[in-house]
Each structure stands twice: as C-alpha cells, then as structure tokens.
Interface confidence: medium
Amino acid sequence: MGSPGMVLGLLVQIWALQEASSLSVQQGPNLLQVRQGSQATLVCQVDQATAWERLRVKWTKDGAILCQPYITNGSLSLGVCGPQGRLSWQAPSHLTLQLDPVSLNHSGAYVCWAAVEIPELEEAEGNITRLFVDPDDPTQNRNRIASFPGFLFVLLGVGSMGVAAIVWGAWFWGRRSCQQRDSGNSPGNAFYSNVLYRPRGAPKKSEDCSGEGKDQRGQSIYSTSFPQPAPRQPHLASRPCPSPRPCPSPRPGHPVSMVRVSPRPSPTQQPRPKGFPKVGEE
C-alpha cells in the first residue's frame, strides 16, 4: 500500500484531470506506407486554448515508449526519438517525428501523447498512425523465385505475355493516334498522371448583451499538407463544407507539410448525420 502522501498526490491528479481540459492532440496520418530506405514523417498537432510553460510529449510504437521529452521555452529537451527518429517542434503547435532512413522494423502502430505539466496537469492522446514499410531490396524476392522448380516456365510465360502485350500495345496506339487525329482531342499524359510518386522526403447573428441594465500540396498518397496552424473558424460565418469540420482558412504561421488535420466543426454547419462526437474528456 502506498504512503498517504502518494495517495493524496494521486487524488489531486485525478481531481485536476476532472477540470475542463483544453488540451487537444491531433495526429496524422492515420495510415502511412513507405518504401524501405525512404523517409516517413508523423505529425502531432498539440493545441491548448491558453498558454503553457512546460509540455511533456511522448511517442510510442506498439505500446513501447520511443521517447518522452518535454518542451519549454520553445525548445525540445531531446532531438532523437527511437532508432533513426528525429524529433522537432514547430511553434505554435506541431510536433514532428521523422524516421530516416526507414527500415522494415519501423513498421507498427505509433501514438503521440502530450501533457501540459505547467501550469496545470492536462493530458491528451492522438489517434494511431499505422506505418507500413515495403521492402525495397530485390534480393528479398530472388531466393523465393529461384527456388521455384518451374522458374524457366515462368520466365517463358512472362516473356511470351510481354511480346503479346507489345503487339497489342502497338495496335492500340495506332488506333488511338487515328482517333486523336479525327477528334482533335489530346488527353496528353492522362495515363501517366495516375502514377503515384513516392518521394523520399515528403516536403498541410449574435443577440444583445448590453451592460447597463477561431495549399494543399498533395505530394503523394503518403503525404498531404498540414495547414499551420489549424484555423479558428468563427461560429457565425456560413460555410458549406462537406467535412464535419470547417474549411481551412488562411492564418499566420509557417506551413509544415505533412498530414491534413481539419479544424473543428462550426456551429453554422449541419451536425454529423450520425450524431455528434462522443462526449468526454480528451
């Protein structure tokens, strides 16, 4: 059994957490798929209504703590976070974990957690980011293919299919050229525009109260832009926005390109069709 002091301390902490929490952690992306040897960037947006003096942050992978530094005076107490992990803080609200180079064992479920330690204890946790790492080494597949007894037949099959594809392609291209000449419409590189590029480093009416009597640079499917900071949307502006939260609007700050985390819903918007978010402290 713990000492009375410990028990009292715990009760004080529990009481403090029952106070209104204004700390929010939004993490992204939900899913990140990268090639081995490339770079993965995970972003955690930490917002609080009022100022804070000291913020404890934590990144975990599959439940294990990677790092647990704090931020004070605008600086991180630690710059590294797990193997090949680099941590950075960009005011006012972005904590970034960059894995470079990514290895196969970086695959896993990452969670960002934050706690304001000063002035008052408040904590919040992000959602999981699932990181999948694709092997990029052709030798990983070589042994498996070479050991296959019918390897020669596979090669022959692939070869003949390749020839057939070339012949078909030439015929198709000829027809396509004729059609384009007839119609005058050129789709240009329509086919190539759908090829995904995987970058190594993915560069986001009020009433009376008289007193007398709150850019999207799409790099690839792996990273989109993170508006910085998340815009505060006034309640009163009418915004036809399909998302359950208001459309981003320009706000001062420097963009950190990562994952888009849209701001909160504006009361002018229609409530979610399936009800409001779960009630409770974050």
Partner: antibody, heavy 120, light 113 residues
C-alpha cells in the same frame, strides 16, 4: 446558426442563490472542442468571466467566485446553467452566456444577456 | 490574476482620423513555446454584445474591416483604427487569453470629435 438565450429571475434577494439557464439552439453543447461560458457585465460596463463548462462536462471557474459559483449542463435539453450562492448587491449585473471554440480562449458568440438585480 | 489596464478611458477622434487605444497587462502575454501573444480585442456598440475584432494580438477576425489592426507584444498592446468611421463609435475592450482566469480591460469609450 448557433444562438444562446439566457433565462431566469430578474430579481434576487441578498443571501439567496441566483440561478440562470442558457439555452443553446442550432448546435449541440456536447460537440467536441466547444466551451460554454458565463460572463457578467456590471452597470459600470466592466466585464467579468465567471467560468465555463466544456463539451465533456469539465468545469473551470474564476477563483474570485469559485466558492460561490457552479456551472452545470443538461445535454438532453441542450442547456447549461449558472448558480451563484450568497449573492449581494455587488452581484447586480447583466449576465451573459457565451461560447468559445476551437481551443482559443476568447468569445465569439454571446447571448442577449439578462439583467439581474440583487435587492431586498 | 493578470490585470488588464486600458488607456485612455475615453477618446474623441474626428471622422477619417486615426484612433489608438492602448492595453497593458500585469505580466507578459507572450509564449515562447507557441510564438503567440494571447490578447484579444472586442468592440461593444450600444445595445449589442461585444464583438471579437482581433485575437493573438494581431490576427484580425474574419469579416472585420482592415482599418482595424492590432499590434504589440509582451505586456503592451495597441488597437488602431486607421480611419475612423461613424459606425466605429463603441466601447472597446482588451482581454487576455493567456491563462485562466480570463480577464478584461475596463474598456475605452470611443466617440466622434
């Protein structure tokens, strides 16, 4: 659009409890990220923040009033309420409900306000 | 608690002229962690609730005319109306949003000279 409407007695006797309700329309008070405040404006125009309740039911109060003030909510009616005990003439003011959103501690939607006089 | 003091208490300015209202806080409202100053400005016209004009000391609220601007850092802040219009007659308040309790200045009454 969101609208806030205060209701309650306009006259309260000294030492009694002042009770006011703010009815919110056009928006759910349980929506994540929203904070529902009470602010009063004295006859001399001075503004005082009294406290707020958040979407999860957590509260924060002005320490100058903490022993006397309670803010609660009724999500089924989409209302939040103010209780101020042991009132004196100094509590005579226009009481307004307001909201702050998106984790920024300032107020962009206000109710019409209701004048409360403390007098025997 | 952070004490907010506005000056002057009242101000008379000619139409088209510049109006300047000052606000001083008893402690710094700047956070080096977020590079933000936690100060807001409101306008309250007779018979209306306060209306948010500026937050984070210098960010203009959506729909607020650009003749309104906020400046300052730390403990000293200014609200400037570059060219006074008749509809700007009101009481102006500053409010810090650095920590709880949130507190307001006593207000500055702006009139036309």
């Amino acid at each position: 659009q969101v609208q806030l409407q205060e209701s309650g007695p306009g006259l309260v006797k000294p030492a009694q409890t002042l009770s006011l309700t703010c009815t919110v329309s056009g928006f759910s008070i349980s929506t994540s990220g929203y904070y529902w405040s009470w602010i009063r404006q004295f006859p001399g125009k001075r503004l005082e923040w009294m406290g707020y309740i958040n979407y999860g039911g957590g509260t924060s109060y002005n320490p100058s009033l903490k022993s006397r003030v309670t803010i609660s909510r009724d999500t089924s009616k989409n209302q939040f309420s103010l209780k101020l005990t042991s009132v004196t003439a100094a509590d005579t003011a226009t009481y307004c409900c307001a909201t702050m959103a998106d984790r920024f501690a300032f107020f962009d939607v206000w109710g019409q306000g209701t004048m409360v006089t403390v007098s025997s | 608690d952070i004490v907010m003091t506005q000056s002057p208490d009242s101000l008379a300015v000619s139409l088209g002229e510049r109006a300047t209202i000052n606000c001083k806080s008893s402690q710094s409202l700047f956070s080096s962690n977020t590079n933000r100053n936690y100060l807001a400005w409101y306008q309250q016209k007779p018979g209306q609730p306060p209306k948010l004009l500026i937050y984070h000391a210098s960010t203009r609220e959506s729909g607020v005319p650009d003749r309104f601007s906020g400046s300052g850092s730390g403990t000293d802040f200014t609200l400037t109306i570059s060219s006074l219009q008749a509809e700007d007659v009101a009481v102006y308040y500053c409010q810090h949003h650095y920590e709880t309790p949130l507190t307001f200045g006593q207000g500055t009454k702006l009139e036309i000279k």
